[in-house]
């Protein structure tokens, strides 16, 4: 491991579509990847009339958009599906939205998934 970098070995797993996909609904996912490639965690969610609905959480393959991000933060302005990625074990437990292009003060929606 390189000093100062959080290696990702496991991420929080969640799948809202677990029955159709025939997976667990929630758990911990071990992350696999090629030698010399980094691993990350991700979260995806929707904002339905102000209500946060988690879609999926899990491991994400080597992606420079995620490098050195200890927090899972979506910065895109009003996406249809929110996505964030981060480095460090279980770093996707909490996620937030800070749009970069906002002129007004950005608001954060940190979310901790509630057990079903």
């Amino acid at each position: 491991a390189i000093l100062g970098r959080s290696e990702t070995q496991e991420c929080l797993f969640f799948n809202a579509n677990w029955e159709k996909d025939r997976t667990n609904q929630t758990g911990v996912e071990p992350c696999y990847g090629d030698k010399d490639k980094r691993r990350h965690c991700f979260a995806t969610w929707k904002n339905i009339s102000g209500s946060i609905e988690i879609v999926k959480q899990g491991c994400w393959l080597d992606d420079i958009n995620c490098y050195d991000r200890t927090d899972c933060v979506e910065k895109k302005d009003s996406p249809e599906v929110y996505f964030c990625c981060c480095e460090g074990n279980m770093c996707n437990e909490k996620f937030s939205y800070f749009p970069e292009m906002e002129v007004t003060q950005p608001t954060s929606n940190p979310v901790t998934p509630k057990p079903p």
């Epitope: 090629d34 490639k37 991700f42 995806t44 879609v55 999926k56 899990g58 491991c59 994400w60 393959l61 080597d62 992606d63 420079i64 958009n65 895109k76 996406p79 249809e80 599906v81 929110y82 996505f83």
Partner: antibody
């Protein structure tokens, strides 16, 4: 092992559309991007666009904006690239590739546009 | 994003070393470690050889190495072998906020 298997060759008329599929196996489809690249006969590689397989978010090269649509079906681990308003210059081999680094590639799909 | 610039062709004899350059700008190649190198044999799909400027893919011989100086990335192949004869492309990471771009390709001939 990671595999990307693409649909077969297509012959299309100018003005029509083509939809090429790319079925992924050997890894978790929703853990990365799928990129699409084309190569005209005797020419170099040309990046067309990308899709985040879990969120469905897409980015397209300016050249193809408005003419290309990339989608992903997570239930079948398959990505699709649809190119519309075809012209003869679109005759090329179309490739899908996994991830931002393009670390695994499909075998390619030859699309021939001819009247 | 404009294409990266590569020489059209390079050549070398077996056992020699060759270097292929890939020139971009200060806003792409110069500022980010996100250049990749691909090898393509005729009629085949490209194969990723090096990612992130200098990280060799598993299974790629250590005769292949990547580096960067300023706005130019380079692929060096030492101890040239006949099977190294192919087209080589540099390209950038693509996904999220990053848009992909390739160099025009370099034909390597082993004499």
């Amino acid at each position: 092992q990671v595999q990307l298997v693409q649909s077969g060759a297509e012959v299309k008329k100018p003005g029509s559309s083509v939809k090429v599929s790319c079925k992924a196996s050997g890894y978790k489809f929703t853990s990365s991007y799928i990129n699409w690249v084309r190569q005209a006969p005797g020419q170099g590689l040309e990046w067309m666009g990308t899709i985040n397989a879990v969120s469905g978010s897409t980015s397209y090269a300016q050249k193809f904006q408005g003419r290309v649509t990339i989608t992903a079906d997570t239930s079948t681990s398959t990505a699709y690239m649809e190119l519309s308003s075809l012209r003869s210059e679109d005759t090329a081999v179309y490739y899908c590739a996994r991830g931002g680094w393009f670390d695994y590639w499909g075998q390619g799909t030859l699309v021939t546009v001819s009247s | 994003q404009s294409a990266l610039t590569q020489p059209r062709s390079v050549s070398g004899s077996p056992g020699q070393s060759v270097t292929i350059s890939c020139t971009g700008t200060s806003s792409d190649v110069g500022s980010k470690n996100y250049v990749n190198w691909y090898q393509q044999h005729p009629g085949k799909a490209p194969k990723l050889m090096i990612h992130g400027v200098s990280k060799r893919e598993s299974g790629v011989p250590d005769r292949f190495s990547g580096s960067k100086s300023g706005n130019t990335a380079s692929l060096t192949i030492s101890g040239l072998q006949a099977e190294d004869e192919a087209d080589y492309y540099c390209g950038t990471f693509a996904g999220g906020k990053y848009y992909g771009v390739f160099g025009g390709g370099t034909k390597l001939t082993v004499l």
